[in-house]
Interface confidence: medium
Amino acid sequence: EICGPGIDIRNDYQQLKRLENCTVIEGYLHILLISKAEDYRSYRFPKLTVITEYLLLFRVAGLESLGDLFPNLTVIRGWKLFYNYALVIFEMTNLKDIGLYNLRNITRGAIRIEKNADLCYLSTVDWSLILDAVSNNYIVGNKPPKECGDLCPGTMEEKPMCEKTTINNEYNYRCWTTNRCQKMCPSTCGKRACTENNECCHPECLGSCSAPDNDTACVACRHYYYAGVCVPACPPNTYRFEGWRCVDRDFCANILSAESSDSEGFVIHDGECMQECPSGFIRNGSQSMYCIPCEGPCPKVCEEEKKTKTIDSVTSAQMLQGCTIFKGNLLINIRRGNNIASELENFMGLIEVVTGYVKIRHSHALVSLSFLKNLRLILGEEQLEGNYSFYVLDNQNLQQLWDWDHRNLTIKAGKMYFAFNPKLCVSEIYRMEEVTGTKGRQSKGDINTRNNGERASCESDVLHFTSTTTSKNRIIITWHRYRPPDYRDLISFTVYYKEAPFKNVTEYDGQDACGSNSWNMVDVDLPPNKDVEPGILLHGLKPWTQYAVYVKAVTLTMVENDHIRGAKSEILYIRTNASVPSIPLDVLSASNSSSQLIVKWNPPSLPNGNLSYYIVRWQRQPQDGYLYRHNYCSKDKIPIRKYADGTIDIEEVTENPKTEVCGGEKGPCCACPKTEAEKQAEKEEAEYRKVFENFLHNSIFVPRPE
C-alpha cells in the first residue's frame, strides 16, 4: 500500500503499527519524542521499501538499530527535504548502529547524523555509494570512532565477508553492523542497481530488483512508476505525481491538498499533478484543474474585518504577505523596529491596490515609502474626514515617497494631506500630485510648505564623478569638488556603496531611520588643497561584482524659506575586475573500465568572473597496502570504550596537540594557534548547528490538538 501524505509517529511507540501495510510512504516519515524506552523487537516492517521525501528520527528512547524496523528500506527519494536533508538522525540516545542494510539510494539531499551519544558504525558506511555528493553530509557529535571499534562481518575470523572501498584515503571494509555488509554492485553494472545475486537490474530500476533487466521487477524506480512498470517519463494522458509515479487526470482530480480540505484540490501543470499552481501561475477559474500565467504578480485579495488594518510592527505587516489587493484602509504607524524597511517590503511589497485610504502617521522609523514597491492604485472608496485618501502626518525621518521616475500611482478619489514631515521636501509632494492625478484637488492648507522639508537638503545640486579605476577588489573614484555659495559651509562628503547585481537600486532601498541601511557608508574629509578633487579608495570588495555608488555633500548652507541646500551624485554602477575562481566543488571520480576514469564536479561557489574552461590534472598513485590499525586479538590494543556524551567531540576535529608538528620542528609542542579563518569557520559551524536545531524544534514541536 502507498501510505501518506507523510507519517508522524510520536509519544507512543505503538503508533508504529500505522506502518504495517506500507510499501511506499508517499511523503515523510517522522519517528520522534518517544521518551519511554520500549522493546522494539516485535516491530518489523519488511514491506516498506521507499520513502519519497525524508526520514527523521529524533529522541526515540530504547531504539538501538533501524535494521530490524526497516530491513528492506531501499530508497529515500528526498523529493522534499528537511532543511536540505533526506535522512536526519538527531539525539537518538540509545541508537548503536543505523543498520539500514538495504538502503542503496538517497536520490536527493544529504544526511545529518548528530548528537547520537552511542552511535557507531558510521565510518564503515560508504555514503558515496548511496548519495551523489557527500560533501554536504553532516556527521558530528556521535560516539568517537576510536571508542567504537567497529568490526565488519568476518574480520575477527580473518574471513572478511564485506567489500572494500576508499574513503578519505582509507581503503577499508564497508558494513552497516557487525553482521551486515554494505551491498555493492559489480562494476559491470555501472550506475545500475543489482539483485541480491549481483545480476544487473534494468536501467530504470533504482536501489535493487527481484529479477535482472526487467522493468517490472524493480524495488523502486529511477524515474517514474506507472501501472507496475518503471518508465523514463510518464506516458501520454498521465502526469508526474509526488516526484515518483504517474497518475491519470481522474486520480489528480480526486485528491485533496494535505494542508486544507477545501474544494479546489490539485492541478495539472507542465505534465505534473501538483497541490497548487506554481509561482507566477493561477487557476483558470475556481473549479479548474489547470493553470494560466498571471499578468504580473498573481492576484491575492486580502480583506480586513474591521475595515482598517493598522501596521505598527513587522508582525502586523506579516498578515499581508502575498496580498496584491487590499480591501480596506491602511494605517501605517511604525515608530521603531529593526531592519524595518526590508521587512515591510517583504510582507507588503506585492500590494498593488488599496480600495480605501492610506494614512501614514508618527512613523518615525520610515525614511521612504518604497517598501510599498508595487502600489499603483488607491481607490479611495472610503475616505478620512475631510475627504482625504492619502494622509501623511508627523513622520520625523520620511525623506522620500517613491522613486517617481519608475512609479505610476493613481489616486482615483479623494485628496492628499501632508504636515509635519520635516525631512520631506515639498518638491517631492508636488511631484506626487502630478503623478497621481490629484493636482488641483488639494486646498491650500493640505500641503504645508513650512513644516514639510524644513530640515532637509531640498535644493540639491548634482555632483559629477570625474574618474573611476577598478581592480579585482578595489574601486577608486573621484568627483568634482562641490562649491556651495559659501565654501565654509561644506563640511564633508559621504560615499554610499553596495553590491548591485542589477541596475535598479534607489537611494532609499532597505533604509530606515533606526540604523538599518543596505548601503555601506564612508565619510570623506575635504582635501586640504582647494584644487584637489575629492575621492576615495573602496577596498575589500568582491571580484567580478557590480557595485552601485553615489556621493552626498554634507553642507550647512541655508537658502530661501530656511531650507538647506545640498548636493549629491547620480547612482554610478561599476564592476570590479575578474579574479581566480574558488575551487570546484564535490569532485567525484569513479572507474567504469580498466582504462578509464569518470570525473565529475560542480562549479565553484565563487566563479569571480566568467568561467571559460576547467583544467583537470591526474597522476598515477602507488597501490596503498592497507594495514590494520588495531590487532583486535591483542588485549592491550582494544580501544577503551567510554560512553560519549553526545556533544561535539573535539578529538574528531583535531589530533592530539602533543604530537603536532609546529614551526617546522618535530617533537612534542603546543598546538598551533588557530588562524582567523579557522576561528571564523568554527563560529559559522556553531551558528549553523544552532540554526538547524532551531529549525528542528520549530518544525516538530506543535501544539496539542484541541
Epitope: 501501472a227 486520480f251 480526486n254 485528491i255 480540505s261
Partner: antibody, heavy 123, light 112 residues
Framework: EVQLQQSGPELVKPGASVRISCKAS????????MNWVKQSHGKSLEWVAN????????NYNQKFKDKATLTVDKSSNTAYMELRSLTSEDTAVYYC????????????????WGTGTLVTVSS | DVLMTQTPLSLPVSLGDHASISCRSS???????????LEWYLQKPGQSPKLLIY???NRFSGVPDRFSGSGSGTDFTLKISRVEAEDLGVYYC?????????FGGGTKLEIK
Amino acid sequence: EVQLQQSGPELVKPGASVRISCKASGYAFTDYYMNWVKQSHGKSLEWVANINPNNGGTNYNQKFKDKATLTVDKSSNTAYMELRSLTSEDTAVYYCARWILYYGRSKWYFDVWGTGTLVTVSS
Amino acid sequence: DVLMTQTPLSLPVSLGDHASISCRSSQSIVQSNGDTYLEWYLQKPGQSPKLLIYRISNRFSGVPDRFSGSGSGTDFTLKISRVEAEDLGVYYCFQGSHVPYTFGGGTKLEIK
C-alpha cells in the same frame, strides 16, 4: 477512455454459486479500490464490499460477509465477486464502481461505474 | 449502521421548476479529520448511477451548475434550480464516512 466492463447476465439455481467479473481499462488498475454495489429490482442501492487491487485487502458490509468473496487478477486488470449459497433474495443487478485508493487525501467518490450484471436466482 | 433517510420518495415537477431533495443520516457523518463524505448520485432508467455532488457541496466535473448541495452534520439537501428533461431519474444520497457505507432510499424526480 475509462471503462468498467462487467460480465453478462447469469441465471443460477438456488444454493449454487456464481462468479461475476469487472474488467477495468483506461486507467491504472492499482490506483483505485474496486467496490461492488447491489441493486434489487425497484429498490435502492446497497454497498457490498471493496478490494484493494495491490494486496487483495478487503472491507465487507457485515450483511454480505458470508455471501460475497472479492478477488482481483492484476495481470488482466479484472476484479471478481463470487456469490455463494444463492437464494431468491440475491436476485439483483450488481455494479462494480471504482474509488480512489489514497489514504488521508482523497475526495472519496464513485466516479466510474460498471455496466451492471444481472444475477437471477431461480429454479 | 448509518441509516440514510431521503424525502420525498417521489417529487413531481414541471420543467423549469426548482426542486429540493432532503437526506438525513441517523448519526453524524463527519469524520474525525473534519471531512464529511456525503455524495449525491443520479440514476436514469436502465443506466448505472452517476456522481453529481461529493463532500456535501462540490460539483463533480461536467455537472451543470444548476445542481447544488448543502448541509452539515446529519441534514443535507440537493437543489436543482431549473429542472430540465435530462434531470429526470432517481436521486440517491450516499455516506462514505462510516463502514458499512450506505445509500438513501432514493427520490424519484418525475414530470407532473
